[in-house]
């Protein structure tokens, strides 16, 4: 099945400093966004290989992408407090599937002490559930649209 | 979650044309991956076309250079441009997110014959 493996589980950073937040996917994906978690989910970026990525405007002029869409690092830079949260990727295939979260602290530079990440991977509760029938499409009509050709992303 | 409401289906002789529209609501429009779907009398929903945030767009084989689908992110909307219509492409059009799989919207039907 497919999967997306999502790396770190969690870093803690200073305010102003950059990370790094990879994903992963063994191919076959049609694009593959970055959500920050929360009571309202918001999109960061989307990133589709070929094509120019689409990014919220909060993080316009801070992000870049090395990689590509199946094994993607995304950098967020110069961030700010109000960018602590969960990150979790979720990749456009024929099911849709997550990563396993990104825990971000964006700390004052004075107590990066007191805030620090356990080993231990973002609690499951953290992450959306996969809504129900979240095949893409409909698992009956799976085979429907055959994979893109590599060509037709390019603008 | 955007809201997603079709129109612009009707009666239409085979050859002939139709623009289907799909009007969202909320504020997340230009990330939503958007797909139109169909459901023929008796058969299972099919998707037809998609297109992603990127505007990529991919379509299912019988529809192939007949079918066009667009979008316009200013003004929250997705299209569905159908020429060259068959007898077989009668069916209720729906539209939805694919990231998200909220519920279906009541679709618009579109009905190709002599």
């Known amino acids: 099945a497919q999967e997306v493996q999502q790396s770190p589980h969690c870093t803690t950073v200073p305010v102003g400093a950059s990370v790094n937040i990879t994903c992963s996917t063994s191919g076959g994906l049609r694009g593959i966004y970055l959500r920050q978690l929360g009571p309202q989910p918001q999109d960061i970026i989307y990133y589709e290989d070929g094509v120019v990525p689409t990014t919220d405007r909060r993080f316009r002029g801070r992000i870049d992408f090395s990689g590509s869409q199946d094994n993607l690092t995304i950098t967020m830079h110069r961030l700010q407090l109000s960018d602590t949260g969960t990150y979790t990727c979720q990749a456009i295939t024929e099911v849709n599937v997550y990563g396993s979260g990104t825990l971000v602290l964006v700390t004052e530079e004075q107590s990066q002490g007191w805030h620090r990440c356990s080993d231990a991977p973002p609690r499951a509760s953290a992450l959306p559930a996969p809504p129900t029938g979240s095949a893409l499409p409909d698992p009956q009509t799976a085979s429907a649209l055959p994979d893109p050709p590599a060509a037709s992303a390019l603008p | 979650q955007v809201q997603l409401v079709e129109s612009g289906g009707g009666l239409v002789k085979p050859g002939g044309s139709l623009r289907l529209s799909c009007a969202a609501s909320g504020s997340s429009f230009h990330f939503a991956f958007m797909g139109w779907y169909r459901q023929a009398p008796g058969k299972q929903r099919e998707l037809v076309a998609d297109?992603?945030?990127?505007?990529?767009?991919n379509y299912a084989d019988p529809v192939k250079g007949r079918f066009t689908i667009s979008r316009d992110n200013a003004k929250n909307s997705l299209y569905l441009q159908m020429n060259s219509l068959r007898a077989e492409d009668t069916a209720v059009y729906f539209c939805?997110?694919?990231?998200?799989?909220?519920?279906w919207g009541q679709g618009t039907l579109v009905t190709v014959s002599s």
């Open positions: 297109i992603s945030p990127g505007n990529s767009t």
């Open positions: 939805r997110d694919l990231r998200s799989w909220g519920a």
